[in-house]
Interface confidence: low
């Protein structure tokens, strides 16, 4: 056993090169200096090591850096990153976006692994907030990244980062996430003109309050039905028939196909039937003519 762990004569590695793929696991352990490996990590990726051999190389780095790898090594891990556990990654201090990109590239095309999730978490916490460049990078690799964050985590996203968000990045966001993201988007896009503003803000409108929808209805935005159906029910209910007509423009005809679904169904129940009739769409279920409509929220405020 003692002889086995000693490096055979002439086999001591002077550099990390292809000759090492012919080394047995114990030879790699005995003949490759950990410090040499650390300085030449960028070469490892170009060499077709087996998974077993990569395990040995990882073990050598673990022994050299028991407190966690330095960033100079992390940046060049390549496929060795796939061998890391979340516990390993929690020891790292990754500050360079280039390092993050290099490691995300290794996992490209796959679902977000626990390793990648831990890496991103470490990186974002190290930066203190989710800045635009980071968000740009993360959503490029994982379009659903933003919607995987809790409302709590989203609250640390600065409005300037919202410029990096694409509509598809919000596809799986739920109402509480949009509640947090919408005010940031409104702030980020506030200096744009009407039509450009609507194009940018449209994906975030699931978090918009009634007053903002009323304002949009005055700007000839022609909101499509898919966007309208994603609006908060409580934000849609107070809108008048005239406001919804202006908000949807030519798309108002689509209300008929959606009349049984929220928020359209609930909105119809709140409107006077004669107002609904002015749309000429045959929408039914409004408050019959002659009935007194009590605004219960106003009544409660007065009591």
């Amino acid at each position: 056993e003692v002889e086995k762990t000693a490096c055979p004569s002439g086999k001591k590695a002077r550099e990390i090169d292809e000759s090492l793929i012919f080394y047995k696991k114990w030879e790699l352990e005995a003949c490759v200096d950990a410090a040499l490996l650390a300085t030449q990590m960028d070469r490892v990726n170009a060499i077709p090591f087996t998974y077993e051999q990569l395990d040995v190389l990882k073990h050598k780095l673990d022994e050299l850096y028991p407190q966690g790898y330095p960033e100079s090594v992390i940046q060049h891990l390549g496929y060795l990153f796939l061998k890391m556990s979340p516990e390993d990654i929690r020891k790292w201090n990754v500050t360079s976006l280039e390092t993050l990109k290099a490691l995300l590239e290794v996992n490209k095309g796959h679902e977000m692994s626990p390793q990648v999730a831990t890496l991103i978490d470490r990186f974002v916490k190290g930066r203190g907030q989710l800045d635009k460049d980071t968000l740009d990078t993360l959503t490029a690799f994982y379009p659903g990244y933003l919607c995987s964050l809790s409302p709590e985590e989203l609250s640390s996203v600065p409005p300037s980062s919202i410029w990096a968000v694409r509509p598809q990045d919000l596809d799986t966001c739920d109402p509480r996430q949009l509640d947090v993201l919408y005010p940031k988007a409104r702030l980020a896009f506030q200096n744009m003109n009407g039509s450009e503003y609507f194009v940018k803000i449209q994906s975030f409108l699931g978090g918009a309050p009634t007053e903002d929808l009323k304002a949009l209805s005055q700007q000839n935005v022609s909101m499509d039905l898919a966007t309208f159906m994603k609006l908060r029910t409580d934000a849609v209910l107070p809108l008048t028939v005239a406001e919804v007509q202006k908000l949807l423009g030519p798309h108002v005809e689509g209300l008929k196909a959606e009349e049984r679904h929220r928020p359209v169904r609930d909105w119809i129940l709140r409107q006077r039937q004669d107002d609904l009739d002015t749309l000429g769409l045959g929408l039914q279920g409004g408050i019959p003519n002659g009935y007194l409509v009590l605004d219960l929220s106003m009544q409660e405020a007065l009591s």
Partner: antibody, heavy 121, light 107 residues
Framework: EVQLVESGGGLVQPGGSLRLSCAAS????????MNWVRQAPGKGLEWVSY????????YYADSVKGRFTISRDNAKNSLYLQMNSLRAEDTAVYYC??????????????WGQGTLVTVSS | DIQMTQSPSSLSASVGDRVTITCRAS??????LNWYQQKPGKAPKLLIY???SLQSGVPSRFSGSGSGTDFTLTISSLQPEDFATYYC?????????FGGGTKVEIK
């Protein structure tokens, strides 16, 4: 061990004010969003208000909007609920609850023992 | 607001019985549903989160299922300490809302 201890409850007349406090210990308070939940005598649970860890996001139930104010002091590990214009229907045991997340889904894993607020003339 | 409707509002059962409580949301809430147990004079206790994930330390006789609008809490074999009131709660959107509760009593 996570501990949440509410205080500040008591008897108050309709229209009066009260300030509830919740002292947190056993965890990094500044990392968690917090909530107030109440329970009227013999009734079910009703969520009252939410505040994110940095106070940047705040939500209220419609029944208390404009009358109650939630706040926190991370340096003091404390959560507060300022209750103004109190009504008889605000009579309840008020709990503070820590919100935990699994992925992006929130749930109340840790609760205080509650403090009773009675609004009566 | 999303309304949560629990049924039954109360039920009587014996030790060893299989008990099922249902909770219905007024609109789809995906899996954003939690279940709590509350005993008289005590704070609620988390049993199940994310519709079906068992909270650490909760006995395996408790299980949750469902997605969208219909959810179920099942106690496979009722124990004496399980007599309490159970609440469902959605965390899909604010205001966060609870079901009206189901009181499980001894038959």
């Amino acid at each position: 061990e996570v501990q949440l201890v509410e205080s500040g409850g008591g008897l108050v007349q309709p229209g009066g004010s009260l300030r509830l406090s919740c002292a947190a210990s056993g965890f990094t308070f500044s990392s968690y969003s917090m909530n107030w939940v109440r329970q009227a005598p013999g009734k079910g649970l009703e969520w009252v208000s939410y505040i994110s860890s940095s106070s940047s996001t705040i939500y209220y139930a419609d029944s208390v909007k404009g009358r109650f104010t939630i706040s926190r002091d991370n340096a003091k590990n404390s959560l507060y609920l300022q209750m103004n214009s109190l009504r008889a229907e605000d009579t309840a045991v008020y709990y503070c609850a820590r919100e935990d997340f699994s992925h992006k889904l929130g749930y109340f894993q840790h609760w205080g023992q509650g403090t009773l607020v009675t609004v009566s003339s | 607001d999303i309304q949560m409707t629990q049924s039954p509002s109360s039920l009587s059962a014996s030790v060893g019985d299989r008990v099922t409580i249902t909770c219905r949301a007024s609109q789809s809430i995906s899996s954003y549903l939690n279940w709590y147990q509350q005993k008289p004079g005590k704070a609620p206790k988390l049993l199940i989160y994310a519709a079906s994930s068992l909270q650490s330390g909760v006995p395996s006789r408790f299980s949750g299922s469902g997605s969208g609008t219909d959810f179920t809490l099942t106690i496979s074999s009722l124990q004496p300490e399980d007599f309490a009131t159970y609440y469902c709660q959605q965390s899909y959107s604010t205001p966060l809302t609870f079901g009206g509760g189901t009181k499980v009593e001894i038959k």
